[in-house]
Structures are given as structure tokens and as C-alpha cells.
């Protein structure tokens, strides 16, 4: 489990405490409070400060990562005096026992795999557990299907992503009978971790002078518009010399995805395949199946 807290302020002051399950920081209420403020400072020199009303004695953090260690701070002014207290949140447990190389990816629009490796100093009996919370509703999802390596959980498969939002909090806790295991946590944007399927319904129609390629944008987990897609077409002339470069064409997403290019008859046999990416991320999908068009005698016009 995540660590207990050490306080670096007079113990008599505010009695600040943090609940990592709810991300709630609380302190003893003071009479006649005129001002209160809570925030944390992380290792990236950023300050995270939730909204707080003067009469509240707690605050909830929405989007924070804790595994590198953070410092919480509470400032309270009353009509008589001012209080300040800091709270260090260390990642207790033996160094190097936390899950490492953590990554997740969404695929096929509604499936997700997360994988990690056991920490280099973790004991043989270590067991890891993944919890996911979305950043808005704070609903917790426990891993339903673990991927195992010699009995140790080293991954997770989810086939229901309905609880996720555009940014989600991932926590990998560890347990062992021998020693304390450090935790790993991460905030991941679905935008960064979704891997698109290749475009579907790729067709090629040719007339005497041109060929028109059409395709459909892939179904995605995120709600995206056509403007969010970038495509690459690989138009390849068959039976060319080894080392001949393929023609790679970049096409921006459109309401109707199409690419028209000059190709006069008789045309040699060609193939075309397409891949897709989020225009702001450029994590390319795999290529669609190659569609052939043209022929040695130039008679073939329409291909699915």
C-alpha cells in the first residue's frame, strides 16, 4: 500500500493528513478562518492547487502523480494568527521494487492492454495490482484480467473502457511478505495511448487518365472529427527493381476521404495501402491490406 506521511511542521499546528485513495488532503478546522489554501509541489517544479472555500478544511486533488514524491502544503489564516504546515509524501518501500516500464495502449477502439516489468530489486514473491481512476468521476476500476509471468502480474487486459475519460490515473501497487514495495502511478491521456486501426473500405477506381482512392476513417475510442486524422498512402508499382522508393503521400482527413492522382492507360500493376494517425500525435496505425490496380495489359479498372 502507499506510504504513511511524515509531517515537517510543529505537530501542534494543523494535523494535516492525506488519503491517497480519495486524493483528499484534510486538516483540523480552525475557528474564525479568514483564508485557507492548499497545494502540492512536485518534482517537475510544478504547483497543483485545487479550488478551496475559506470555510473548508480539506481539498481534493484531481490530476496528480505521487510516486516520485510530492510535498503538500496548507496555509490557514484566522482572525488571530496564521498557520502553515508541510507534509512530505514519500514513496516508502525498498528502492527499485516498484513496477517499471509501465505503458498502456487502446486498440480496436474498445480494448486496452497495460504492461509493466517487475522492479529490479523486488523479491520473488512480489505481486502487483493495477487500479484505474478517471480524472473526473474518480470511479475506480480494478484490473479484471491480469497477464502473468511465473505467477507475477506483469500486465492487464481491459475489454470495457466505459469508465474511462480523456485522462485517467493508473496506479500499480505491490505487495510482498518480505519487504515493503513501492508504488508506481501515472496520468495517461487517451489521446496519447490510442492506436488506430488502419482505414477500412479502401477502394480504387481508375479511368483512362486518373485513379481515385477512397477509404473510411477508422472507428476510434475517442470522439474525433475528420480534422483529427492524417493519412499516409503508399502507392507502389509492382515488379520494380529492388531499392526503388515507394511513393508516400500525406493526406489530411476530410468529410469524404479520397485521393485522386494521374495515371494514364495502359497502366502497370500497382498496389496501394493506407495508414492513419491522430494529426497531433502521429502514432501511425498498421497499414491496410494492399489493394491492387492496373495490370500488365492495362484493362483492369475497378478494384475493392
Amino acid at each position: 500500500e502507499k506510504s504513511d506521511l511524515r509531517t515537517v511542521a510543529p505537530a501542534s499546528s494543523l494535523n494535516v493528513r492525506f488519503d491517497s485513495r480519495t486524493m483528499n488532503l484534510s486538516w483540523d478546522c480552525q475557528e474564525n478562518t479568514t483564508f485557507s489554501k492548499c497545494f502540492l509541489t512536485d518534482k517537475k517544479n510544478r504547483v497543483v492547487e485545487p479550488r478551496l472555500s475559506n470555510n473548508e478544511c480539506s481539498c481534493t486533488f484531481r490530476e496528480i502523480c505521487l510516486h516520485e514524491g510530492v510535498t503538500f502544503e496548507v496555509h490557514v489564516n484566522t482572525s488571530q494568527r496564521g498557520f502553515q504546515q508541510k507534509l512530505l509524501y514519500p514513496n516508502s518501500g525498498r528502492e527499485g521494487t516498484a513496477a517499471q516500464n509501465f505503458s498502456c495502449f487502446i486498440y480496436n477502439a474498445d480494448l486496452m492492454n497495460c504492461t509493466w516489468a517487475r522492479g529490479p530489486t523486488a523479491p520473488r514473491d512480489v505481486q502487483y495490482f493495477l487500479y484505474i481512476r478517471n480524472s473526473k468521476r474518480r470511479r475506480e476500476i480494478r484490473c479484471p484480467y491480469y497477464i502473468q509471468d511465473s505467477g507475477t502480474h506483469v500486465g492487464c487486459h481491459l475489454d470495457n473502457l466505459s469508465g474511462l475519460t480523456s485522462r485517467n490515473y493508473f496506479l500499480v501497487n505491490g505487495t510482498s511478505r518480505e519487504i515493503g514495495i513501492q508504488f508506481f502511478d501515472s496520468l495517461l491521456d487517451t489521446k496519447k495511448i490510442e492506436r488506430f486501426n488502419p482505414p477500412s473500405n479502401v477502394t480504387v477506381r481508375c479511368n483512362t487518365t486518373h485513379c481515385l482512392v477512397r477509404w473510411k476513417q477508422p472507428r476510434t475510442y475517442q470522439k474525433l472529427s475528420y480534422l483529427d486524422f492524417q493519412y499516409q498512402l503508399d502507392v507502389h508499382r509492382k515488379n520494380t527493381q529492388p531499392g526503388t522508393e515507394n511513393l508516400l503521400i500525406n493526406v489530411s482527413g476530410d468529410l469524404e476521404n479520397r485521393y485522386n492522382f494521374p495515371s494514364s492507360e495502359p497502366r502497370a500493376k500497382h498496389s496501394v495501402k493506407i495508414r492513419a494517425a491522430d494529426v497531433r500525435i502521429l502514432n501511425w496505425s498498421s497499414w491496410s491490406e494492399a489493394i491492387e490496380f492496373g495490370s500488365d495489359d492495362g484493362h483492369h479498372h475497378h478494384h475493392h
Epitope: 517537475k44 517544479n45 510544478r46 485545487p50 497531433r280
Partner: antibody, heavy 123, light 107 residues
Framework: QMQLVQSGAEVKKPGASVKVSCKVS????????MHWVRQAPGKGLEWMGG????????IYAQKFQGRVTMTGDTSTDTAYLELSSLRSEDTALYYC????????????????WGQGTLVTVSS | EIVMTQSPATLSLSPGERATLSCRAS??????LAWYQQKPGQAPRLLIY???SRATGIPDRFSGSGSGTDFTLTISRLEPEDFAVYYC?????????FGQGTKLEIK
């Protein structure tokens, strides 16, 4: 099309506070994360922080800790940046900025910018 | 935090010429890179995101390339209105940091 319109230039004395506004049109403030970027005269761009009007949480650079407050009024779709204990090195153009895809700690590119508010700190 | 370094600091060219601006990240930022153009007295304008995708309304003489740590903004044929300051920005890791800028001036 979204537009961000900022308040006018301000001249302040060292130690004073300034509050800059950024009015959103073509969108509602609750749909956005609003960011503030500043630019000292003749210098580059510096991200100050971002604010989520929906949950009220702010993420900002530690160098501004204790001096910066980012807020929003969802009834008027206006975001605010307040900077206190002003010093001469705070003299800069202050921009509000947002994008099509944002979180409070940044955007996947800032698509939309206010026109900037010049804050001059001088005794 | 990730440090973005742009070069050259100033680039002097004539209209019609080709401009090549460089941006280097202190660690890999994948393709999470944007380019902005800023003219005197104006706010920055987004030109490129995803290292190579042009933002809406940006002429095709502007192109971006690169991934990982090394990125390039190319203006194939300079128009008089292209003379400005250009900034790169990474959005891989918060805080999202800007380069110090390259001033493109008329020779």
C-alpha cells in the same frame, strides 16, 4: 470560431497586484482548460500555468508559487489571471491561450490566443 | 523539465529563398512538437502540430519534419509576410516548454 479577448494594458508599482481578464466567445469556459503564457520585452514565450474551470484546479510553474491565482467566471465565460507582489521582472505581455485538445497542464498545441495584455511594473 | 534549443538565433534571407529552422529537445519528445509564428505586436499563431501537420489555414509552403529530439521547420519559398519570429514547443511532458525562438529577417 473561438475568440479570446483580453483586458487592456496596466501600469503597476512594485509590490502591487494586477488582474488580467480573458473573455471567451464561440465556446463556453467550462469546456476549456485556460492557459496563461507570458513574454517579457524582446524575450521568448514562458508557460505560467493552466486552469480547469470545471473543477477549479490550477497547475502552474513553481516560480510563481504564492503569487499567482487563476480563476474563471463561468457565468460570463471569462478567465482571470492575478499576479501579486509585482516586481520589475514581471513586466511582460500576458497571453491567455487554449486549444482544441487541452488539459490543465498543457495543450496539444495552442490553437487560440488572446491579443495579449501588457503589464508594466515601474516605480 | 525538457529544454528546447532553436538554431540559428537569427536567419537572414531574401524573399523567394528557402528557410530551414531547427529545434532540438534535451530528450525525446516523440512527435509531440508544435511550431508557432509571431509577428511584431501580434500573438503567436499555431503553424504546425504533431511535428509535421499543418494547422488550419496554413499555406503549404510551410512544412515540418523530425521526431525524437531533432525537428525542422522549412519554408520552401519565402514570402514577405513570412519574416517573423518562430518558436517550437514540446507537448510531450509537462511543463510544456518553448524554444527561445528564431528570428527570420529580410536580408
Amino acid at each position: 470560431q473561438m475568440q479570446l479577448v483580453q483586458s487592456g494594458a496596466e501600469v503597476k508599482k512594485p509590490g502591487a497586484s494586477v488582474k488580467v481578464s480573458c473573455k471567451v466567445s464561440g465556446h463556453t469556459l467550462t469546456e476549456l482548460s485556460m492557459h496563461w503564457v507570458r513574454q517579457a520585452p524582446g524575450k521568448g514565450l514562458e508557460w505560467m500555468g493552466g486552469f480547469d474551470p470545471e473543477d477549479g484546479e490550477t497547475i502552474y510553474a513553481q516560480k510563481f508559487q504564492g503569487r499567482v491565482t487563476m480563476t474563471g467566471d463561468t457565468s460570463t465565460d471569462t478567465a482571470y489571471l492575478e499576479l501579486s507582489s509585482l516586481r520589475s521582472e514581471d513586466t511582460a505581455l500576458y497571453y491567455c491561450a487554449t486549444g482544441r485538445y487541452c488539459h490543465k497542464d498543457g495543450c496539444y498545441g495552442f490553437d487560440y490566443w488572446g491579443q495579449g495584455t501588457l503589464v508594466t511594473v515601474s516605480s | 523539465e525538457i529544454v528546447m534549443t532553436q538554431s540559428p538565433a537569427t536567419l537572414s534571407l531574401s524573399p523567394g529563398e528557402r528557410a530551414t529552422l531547427s529545434c532540438r529537445a534535451s530528450q525525446s519528445v516523440s512527435s509531440y512538437l508544435a511550431w508557432y509564428q509571431q509577428k511584431p505586436g501580434q500573438a503567436p499563431r499555431l503553424l504546425i502540430y504533431g511535428a509535421s501537420s499543418r494547422a488550419t489555414g496554413i499555406p503549404d509552403r510551410f512544412s515540418g519534419s523530425g521526431s525524437g529530439t531533432d525537428f525542422t521547420l522549412t519554408i520552401s519559398r519565402l514570402e514577405p509576410e513570412d519574416f517573423a519570429v518562430y518558436y517550437c514547443q514540446q507537448y510531450d511532458s509537462s511543463p510544456h516548454t518553448f524554444g527561445q525562438g528564431t528570428k527570420l529577417e529580410i536580408k
